[in-house]
């Protein structure tokens, strides 16, 4: 006998997973045997459509790989034609284990700024997510949340903060771990310890002291008067994030030394600056101060300049005399810019003299010091120009005038070969006499304020200068 | 009483082809699903082929997609297998199986004898 | 396509002892999972369909229960016509799959 549809099998809830198999079952009893036909959503689902397998004459629909657009009311209507059509209806919820979409990345942060690590989540229930530092799960406190979106948010990083991190997001279904990332805090240069001011004798030896810190460990430079340090040792060491850096110098002039700390984070560099001066206490001039001893020159750097086997003064006030000495006429080289090769062995000359004076040795030895016609030679001929920009210097206050008067000696004060001949030294490597004279750049100071004398001429008609040291 | 009966099985080499049958009896052919199963010697049970009431819808297992064809007859209340492209591994006990769907899901209740299929070279 | 594992592979059991196996699909699959018992040289047997019906004819020491994803066929007194293997097959998906058996053996 003909019999309207009956649904044996209502349509239930069905959970699926994404790219799952979903079926529906619409069992129906009836005669003749129904068409069924089947909605989503009341869009009716067409048979052909191969993500879906119909069976048993419609009363299986089969989703065959389910994906997140599936979501709906799915609904089956059977009709034979006896009695009307009936219908039942179920949802399919996709469930989906949990995705991490967005997942954290290596961070590094300058310490006290705020860090966001993301990590956003796709899940059916939706996922908790919760933070692992290291090996043990992140707590929440005032400054470190987990955001709604799954992110975590780091206010005011502290250097602590750094370390390995990873979201793990959980649902019914299952878990997902983020893959480890690196939160790195940077911190910018500090100074921990700055040089201290010192004032010394002429010819000490000091050692400036700068500690820093940062991360990453910040590189110390150090400055002379604005520039980099042209000489002294520098010793450095880095322990526990923390550099030390101690320069030793040889005092022969006053100056402003500063610590330079300096760290890069990114394509920024953050510095941080200590400064400490250099000053000389008065020194009393070798000549007037006979403080010293007479010995025979043993150094390098006036070999060439001094006579051989000369008894030179040797001052006392200086731990190491020959060593403070010989470094003293060094340094008063290198004072000395530009110098062409008419003055360089003049100057070298002079500065070799006036530093080791000659020596005159009794029960009180005695400097003897230049006469002041060769020291005058010096200024006015052979080292004219040189002489107005080291003057020039001074007056600008590029060097302290004490300091100047070490590294060239003031002709005026110097004694006359005039008054007492045995009184001063003479410079027997100036040879020169008044036909040279014309070899000479025309004099660009005024008239000389002496007269200049026919100056001896000594048996060594060459100047020779040591290759070792300029007078740049 | 449900009867169903194979047919068709042999000896082929390897690239030869085989049609097998399944004569059907005892019920209203023309309204049940079919399938075929095999069995392998010393093996385990693996679905082959289904094919639905009205030859509207045929699946197969990946293993002999593209190599197997299932078919049916209602006229004559038959079953078919076409196997062509034959491999060493299609060696089997082939059965034929009637779906059951009432009152709960679909299940094989009726299963024929089995005809044997080698496959050697 | 949905994996059917069964568990154990084999077993030995003596006459008159409970015996359990366990059938895991790989995704849920409601109740649609059905038990085969085969002898040697002889097609499979229904037992029970929808994880838990009997099938008419066969004896009531046969049980089955699960849903979802894990399914298990139980036998309360073993009788000598029980030694044979045992199939879950799954019929969610229309590729239907079947477990690869357990063998229940004679201790």
């Known amino acids: 006998l003909p019999k309207a549809p009956v649904i044996t099998t209502p349509l239930e809830t069905v959970d699926a997973l994404v790219e799952e198999v979903a079926t529906f079952m619409c069992a129906v009893e009836s005669y003749p045997q129904p068409e069924i036909s089947w909605t989503r959503n009341k869009i009716l689902i067409k048979l052909f459509d191969t993500r879906y397998s119909i069976r048993e004459n419609g009363q299986l629909l089969t989703i065959l790989s389910v994906e997140d657009s599936d979501d709906g009311i799915y609904c089956c209507t059977a009709n034979n034609g006896v009695g009307g059509a009936v219908e039942s209806c179920g949802a399919l919820q996709v469930k989906m284990k949990p995705k991490i979409t967005r997942p954290p990345i290596n961070v590094k942060i300058i310490e006290g700024l705020k860090a966001v690590l993301p990590c956003t989540t796709m899940g059916n229930p939706k996922p908790s997510v919760s933070w692992i530092k290291g090996d043990s799960p992140l707590r929440e406190n005032s400054r470190i949340a987990v955001l709604e979106s799954g992110s975590l948010r780091i206010h005011n990083v502290q250097k602590e903060d750094a370390g390995q991190y990873r979201c793990v997001a959980k649902n019914s279904l299952g878990t997902a771990y983020s893959k480890v990332v690196k939160l790195e805090v940077e911190v910018f240069a500090r100074i921990l310890r700055a040089p201290e001011s010192h004032n010394v004798t002429f010819g000490s030896f000091v050692t400036l002291h700068c500690t820093a810190t940062g991360i990453p460990v910040p590189t110390i430079t150090w400055i002379e008067n604005g520039n980099a340090v042209s000489s002294g040792s520098i010793q450095e060491s880095v322990k526990d994030r923390v550099i030390d850096s101690r320069l030793q110098l040889f005092i022969t002039k006053p100056g402003l030394y500063t610590c330079i700390a300096t760290n890069k984070h990114g394509e920024k560099f953050s510095t941080a600056k200590a400064a400490a001066t250099i000053s000389i206490a008065e020194w009393s001039k070798p000549q007037k101060d006979n403080k010293g001893y007479c010995a025979q020159y043993r150094g390098e750097v006036c070999n060439a300049v001094l006579a051989k086997d000369a008894l030179v003064f040797l001052n006392t006030s200086y731990a190491d005399p020959e060593e403070a000495q010989e470094l003293l006429v060094h340094t008063a080289w290198n004072e000395l810019k530009v110098v062409s090769p008419v003055c360089r062995p003049a100057a070298e000359a002079l500065l070799c003299n006036h530093i080791f004076q000659e020596c005159s040795p009794g029960v009180v030895p005695t400097p003897i010091p230049i006469c002041r016609e060769y020291c005058l030679a010096v200024k006015e001929l052979f080292c004219a120009k040189e002489w107005l920009v080291m003057e020039e210097k001074t007056h600008r206050g590029l060097y302290r005038s004490e300091m100047h008067l070490l590294s060239v000696p003031e002709c005026s004060k110097l004694p006359s070969m005039h008054w007492d001949p045995t009184a001063c030294a003479r410079l027997p490597h100036l040879d020169y006499n008044k036909e040279n004279l014309k070899t000479f750049p025309p004099m660009t100071s005024s008239k000389p304020s002496v007269d200049i004398p026919n100056l001896p001429s000594s048996s060594s008609s060459s100047f020779s200068v040591s290759p070792t040291y300029s007078m740049t | 009483e449900v009867q169903l009966v194979e047919s068709g099985g042999g000896l082929v080499k390897p690239g030869e082809s085989l049609r097998l049958s399944c004569a059907a009896s005892?019920?209203?052919?023309?309204?049940?699903?079919m399938h075929w199963v095999r069995q392998a010697p010393g093996k385990g049970l693996e679905w082959v082929s289904s094919?639905?009431?009205?030859?509207?819808?045929?699946y197969y297992a990946d293993s002999v997609k593209g190599r197997f064809t299932i078919s049916r007859d209602i006229a004559k209340n038959s079953l078919y297998l076409q196997m062509n492209s034959l491999r060493a591994e299609d060696t089997a006990v082939y059965y034929c199986?009637?779906?059951?769907?009432?009152?709960?899901?679909?299940?094989?209740?009726?299963w024929g004898q089995g005809t044997l299929v080698t496959v050697s070279s | 396509d949905i994996q059917m594992t069964q568990s154990p592979s084999s077993l030995s059991a003596s006459i008159g002892d409970r015996v359990t196996i366990s059938c895991r699909a790989s995704q849920r699959i409601s109740s649609f999972l059905n038990w085969y018992q085969q002898k040697p040289g002889k097609p499979p047997n229904l037992l029970i369909y929808?994880?838990?019906n009997l099938q008419s004819g066969v004896p009531s020491r046969f049980s089955g229960s699960g849903s979802g994803t894990d399914f298990t066929l139980t036998i309360t007194s073993l009788q000598p016509e029980d030694y044979a293997i045992y199939y879950c097959q799954q019929s969610y998906s229309p590729m239907y799959t079947f477990g690869q058996g357990t063998s229940l053996e004679i201790k």
């Open positions: 929808g994880a838990s």
């Open positions: 005892g019920f209203n052919f023309s309204t049940y699903t």
């Open positions: 094919i639905s009431s009205r030859s509207a819808y045929k």
């Open positions: 199986a009637r779906d059951f769907f009432q009152l709960g899901p679909p299940r094989f209740d009726s």
